[in-house]
């Protein structure tokens, strides 16, 4: 039975040439995370992190993201195509997978707040 | 409860174009993120496009870039899936979905809360 929460940043804003932190948080289960991955609405892989074996960021984003915090991810350098989804999937034994929404809105405005705050999607 | 009612489905020669209406009804339909998924025979459900409520954000598939456009009337309740250069591999049922709430696009299916019935769009020549 799978009684775990994913909690997010929810929804997000920032500044076009900035950066941004990624965070999906599971709460309510002591199941074991074996791995995180990072995607976008697109299907494509940001980057995993195993428990074994740490992280791996995917080629096309190895210049605009890092690892962490914790289980989170960084997206730098934000360009206006980065707005959309991400989506975070907790695989955990013996629960299952575990998934979470994030929606960032890249803005051109300079004076773009950064806004975040955590949810559930 | 809100209720989903797809039209416009048919069939079409390879190369034309179809329009997709999906009344709702029964709810706020101005807040509601929308999309639309098809299904194709023997094949997975899949995401083809989706609308913010306030029409700012859109998804499109891949396959369907530049090909389809999704649109939405607020003050008529209705959600729009223009489709040009319709192809053989188009053919599919496709169903319209509504989130009760929610910022942005949602371009998957597990996060939507009420769905149509679907309407069979078939491209043969």
């Known amino acids: 039975m799978m009684t775990g929460t994913i909690e997010t940043t929810g929804n997000i804003s920032a500044k076009k040439g900035g950066s941004v932190i990624l965070q999906c948080h599971l709460s309510s289960t002591m199941a074991q995370v074996t791995q995180v991955n990072w995607e976008q609405h697109d299907h494509s892989l940001l980057a995993i992190r195993n428990a074994e074996l740490g992280w791996h960021i995917y080629p096309a984003f190895k210049d605009r993201v890092a690892p962490g915090p914790g289980l989170g991810l960084t997206l730098q350098s934000l360009t206006m195509n980065d707005t959309g989804e991400y989506f975070c999937t907790y695989h955990t034994y013996p629960d299952g997978t575990y998934r979470g929404r994030i929606f960032l809105e890249v803005l051109e405005s300079s004076v773009a707040e950064h806004s975040a705050r955590f949810q559930i999607p | 409860q809100v209720q989903l009612v797809e039209s416009g489905g048919g069939v079409v020669q390879p190369g034309r174009s179809l329009r997709l209406s999906c009344a709702a009804s029964g709810g706020s339909f101005s807040s509601y993120p929308m999309g639309w998924f098809r299904q194709a025979p023997g094949k997975e459900r899949e995401s083809v496009a989706a609308i913010s409520s306030d029409m700012r954000f859109t998804y499109y598939a891949d396959s369907v870039k530049g090909r389809f456009t999704i649109s939405r009337d607020n003050s008529k309740n209705t959600l729009y899936l223009q489709m040009n250069s319709l192809r053989a591999e188009d053919t599919a049922v496709y169903y319209c979905?509504?989130?009760?709430?929610?910022?942005?696009?949602?371009?998957?299916?597990?996060?939507?809360?009420?769905w149509g019935q679907g309407t069979l769009v078939t491209v043969s020549s």
């Open positions: 979905a509504a989130r009760d709430s929610g910022v942005g696009y949602y371009s998957r299916a597990q996060w939507y809360d009420y």
